[in-house]
Amino acid sequence: CKAMHVAQPAVVLASSRGIASFVCEYASPGKATEVRVTVLRQADSQVTEVCAATYMMGNELTFLDDSICTGTSSGNQVNLTIQGLRAMDTGLYICKVELMYPPPYYLGIGNGTQIYVIDPEPCPDSDF
């Protein structure tokens, strides 16, 4: 057994449409067949769940229909996209990876990605 390491970028800038994408990579110590990936937002000491998905290795990552997240998986790498972000959503987004099956269970937590969101300036009215 060895601890599971999770890597994610330190900083990401959301697009003007409020979309942020980043890669969450984990060093799997075992041959997991079922993996759960959770995105958490940490503000002060409060940690809230943004979205979560469980997938079988080799299959696609599927978030719930009403989730603000989408993602794809490739080996030990998950490409995550969070949409609908606004300036007030700027914060630290932590990637949490759990190897659910087979035993033993492993937990890995990334250091977090600081996502900066800048609301677009409203278009000035045009006089014709």
Epitope: C1, L40, I109
Partner: antibody
Framework: QVQLVESGGGVVQPGMSLRLSCAAS????????MHWVRQAPGKGLEWVAV????????HYADSVKGRFTISRDSSKNTLYLQMNSLRAEDTAVYYC???????????WGQGTLVTVSS | EIVLTQSPGTLSLSPGERATLSCRAS???????LAWYQQKPGQAPRLLIY???SRATGIPDRFSGSGSGTDFTLTISRLEPEDFAVYYC?????????FGPGTKVDIK
Amino acid sequence: QVQLVESGGGVVQPGMSLRLSCAASGFTFSSYGMHWVRQAPGKGLEWVAVIWYDGNNRHYADSVKGRFTISRDSSKNTLYLQMNSLRAEDTAVYYCARGGRLGAFDYWGQGTLVTVSS
Amino acid sequence: EIVLTQSPGTLSLSPGERATLSCRASQSVSSSCLAWYQQKPGQAPRLLIYGASSRATGIPDRFSGSGSGTDFTLTISRLEPEDFAVYYCQQYGISPFTFGPGTKVDIK
């Protein structure tokens, strides 16, 4: 506020069965892993079992594997521990605990005492 | 399984003194997955520190955690009367999740 309340403890004879319950309130029960931890009289803490999220995955300590079954009913916000073939060494206070967002056990019940004695 | 060893077994100190508790793992533990709990007689454990160094909600700043790999430390900068209790470290990164045997901090 988060609350966990265990029940079902008592005195049983070796070889008998007992089912513990843990009623949860104040949080979205199905979104958290839930654990049982026990403490023998005058001893330290021993992790017993965990059930994850939707209830499909469970893990157990070797000392209880094959004898204890952890389960959950999300419609009732209740966690269970079915204990079969009880032994004297299972005598302990049994706590249910919530696995927090970042994994540590952030909330605990007050515990229920199980005594296995002939 | 990962075995956690705590030292000393008992620490006898006076209020106002500094307490340093050690937790050593039999193999490397992710610092994200190391916690400290406080337990008083007749009570359930209470989470103090998670992720080796982050204080849980409502925990006073006299409690601090540090360490990585196999060596972790809980420090209580100035002991208050209510801090005399048993302290357990725990790893929750790999099942089975394991606790150390505990360090009892008692009044000298």
